[in-house]
């Protein structure tokens, strides 16, 4: 988890399509009751935007204190501001909660740039626009932080939805979702629809805008089109998956697929960009530049630093290629692909553009910690985190931004051999995953 690149903004071996469709597990057979269908009360419960994160309203303590909490599938702590901070409108006041219990233990979470630290405790937590339950959960009360909270982001804490293995200070601290599933009848699954605006939002528009949906305990069919395709969760720490092939406008990058997953590939709602390992990033940018070679953009644009602006409404989406990631399927030797548009990987930037201009940052960047499928990817898709069956599902999001010529896609099956070889085995050490 890289502060400075992660939010809080701290921004293969593919084959030809099969003639006949391989069997795949979609969402026809519910595992638990109430797991599928309509979750009206949870639809549209997220706000925010990709550059500053998506947040859900939660209540903590007795009487309930309402806070906006960043939804982060790339970490595993529930941590909230618990002391005054210039960027916080409100914070958790433990002394006002009759149900707060102090664990008499500290927690320190350093990032590449910045950090937060706090005191551990438990309290009663609920999600007003979520399941109608209250759980006692571990809470890190953030008492000190550096470059963690974002001015104007409108959130006051972070909900780490990944697994206990990466919880701080150690894996004995039960993450919120584990507590929720243990203490209630909520199925062990959640799904996210992050809706990128496709255009810059000013502060008042963000506060008024709908950012998407977090469906806790199920799948809402109204949030996606087509079929859900599932990829196995390789290991339960981050939401780790395996990418087996990458294409730019249908052209295979032709790299050893291990490179795509070096040293891991994760699905992370708390990261803005699609982040790629150095070699993969360089090959991808070279290919994207070649595909859009009728134009020449400044070096700083490809580094995600400079903005490119076009007169409002004239952004030449057609000159930019689509990007396809092939993911390991659930069936042996079968993969599927998810395809994003430039509308996802060119991120609209507020404040800079005039009413005459639409300005964008290139939202694909280099990583030293593996591939991170951040908001740039997730905004194209409805993503199902099916923890019960150790898999992640992708379908085309009903809210993704596209044009009249191209749309994001989830397609399959494709024959792909030796996919297990695409995974990288990280040498087992005790080093901090947050410090890499």
């Amino acid at each position: 988890t890289q502060h400075g690149i992660r939010l809080p903004l701290r921004s293969g071996l593919g084959g030809a399509p099969l003639g006949l469709r391989l069997p795949r597990e979609t969402d026809e057979e519910p595992e638990e009751p109430g797991r599928r269908g309509s979750f009206v009360e949870m639809v549209d419960n997220l706000r925010g935007k990709s550059g500053q994160g998506y947040y859900v309203e939660m209540t903590v303590g007795s009487p309930p204190q309402t806070l906006n909490i960043l939804v982060d599938t790339g970490s595993s702590n529930f941590a909230v501001g618990a002391a005054p901070h210039p960027f916080l409108h409100r914070y958790y006041q433990r002394q006002l909660s009759s149900t707060y219990r102090d664990l008499r233990k500290g927690v320190y979470v350093p990032y590449t740039q910045g950090k937060w630290e706090g005191e551990l405790g438990t309290d009663l937590v609920s999600i007003p626009h979520g399941p109608n339950v209250t759980v006692r959960a571990n809470i890190a009360a953030i008492t000190e932080s550096d470059k963690f909270f974002i001015n104007g982001s409108n959130w006051e804490g972070i909900l780490g939805l990944a697994y206990a293995e990466i919880a701080r200070p150690d894996d004995s601290l039960e993450p919120f979702f584990d507590s929720l599933v243990k203490q209630t009848h909520v199925p062990n699954l959640f799904s996210l629809q992050l809706c990128g605006a496709g255009f810059p939002l000013n502060q008042s528009e963000v506060l008024a805008s709908v950012g998407g949906s977090m469906i806790i305990g199920g799948i809402d069919h109204s949030l996606y089109t087509g079929s859900l395709w599932y990829t196995p969760i390789r290991r339960e720490w981050y939401y780790e998956v395996i990418i087996v092939r990458v294409e730019i406008n249908g052209q295979d990058l032709k790299m050893d697929c291990k490179e795509y997953n070096y040293d891991k590939s994760i699905v992370d709602s708390g990261t803005t960009n699609l982040r790629l390992p150095k070699k993969v990033f360089e090959a991808a940018v070279k290919s994207i530049k070649a595909a859009s070679s009728t134009e020449k953009f400044p070096d700083g644009f490809w580094l995600g630093e400079q903005l490119v602006c076009w007169q409002a409404g004239t952004t030449p989406w057609n000159i930019f290629p689509v990007i396809s990631l092939y993911l390991m399927g659930e069936v042996t030797n079968q993969s599927f692909r998810i395809t994003i548009l430039p509308q996802q990987y060119l991120r609209p930037v507020e404040d800079v553009a005039t009413s005459q201009d639409d300005c964008y940052k290139f939202a694909i960047s280099q990583s030293s910690t593996g591939t991170v499928m951040g908001a740039v990817i997730m905004e194209g898709f409805y993503v199902v985190f099916d923890r019960a069956r150790k898999r992640i599902g992708f379908a085309v999001s009903a809210c993704h931004v596209h044009d009249e010529f191209r749309t994001a896609a989830v397609e399959g099956p494709f024959v792909t051999l030796d996919m297990e070889d695409c995974g990288y085995n990280i040498p087992q050490t005790d080093e901090s995953t947050l410090m890499t």
Epitope: S293, K296, D299, G300, E305, Q306, V308, C309, C359
Partner: antibody, heavy 120, light 108 residues
Framework: QLQLQESGPGLVKPSETLSLTCTVS??????????WGWIRQPPGKGLEWIGM???????WYNPSLKSRVTISVDTSKNQFSLKLSSVTAADTAVYYC????????????WGRGTLVTVSS | EIVLTQSPATLSLSPGERATLSCRAS??????LAWYQQKPGQAPRLLIY???KRATGIPARFSGSGSGTDFTLTISSLEPEDFAVYYC??????????FGGGTKVEIK
Amino acid sequence: QLQLQESGPGLVKPSETLSLTCTVSGGSISSSSYYWGWIRQPPGKGLEWIGMIYYSGSTWYNPSLKSRVTISVDTSKNQFSLKLSSVTAADTAVYYCARVGHGVSYFDLWGRGTLVTVSS
Amino acid sequence: EIVLTQSPATLSLSPGERATLSCRASQSVSSYLAWYQQKPGQAPRLLIYGASKRATGIPARFSGSGSGTDFTLTISSLEPEDFAVYYCQQVYTWPPRTFGGGTKVEIK
């Protein structure tokens, strides 16, 4: 070394079209590393970016002038040109052509400039 | 739109003195800022790009600093040929169309 030289009439009548050409010598206009741009400076005033072109013909214009500006490139002659239609006295300025280098961001090489007066 | 404000409008100094010119952006432009020098009757010349990098052939007495919104061009010891107008330009937003209004450095 590479040089830029503007050429064209020094006097244009109101409502007519101003036409200027920039000739690139000592290097190729077809280099993929550069854009080629036009900037103007009214007498005693500051610099105003007009627009620029890539050898492929891709153009970028200042929105305030866009409806009147056309920039084109002739790679066979190693030249690029500016046309500004429906001119008025406010278009009187020294017109510079320049190369956009240093990571396609900064005007790292300029022509000497040519004064164009709009008057009847 | 990002606006660049240069100050002072005029700086009256003697040869050998130190000149400090300011350029302030209405919002952050990171380090994507350039400085140009223009002598009377001549075209502008690139002095500094990337806020602090000297362009080819520019003497060491010229230095640039700053990032975000506040930038400074310093001429450590003015030579007679340094009396000119200096412009800043931001290219954080591209295409590179925004110049400051200029600072005239004149002989006192």
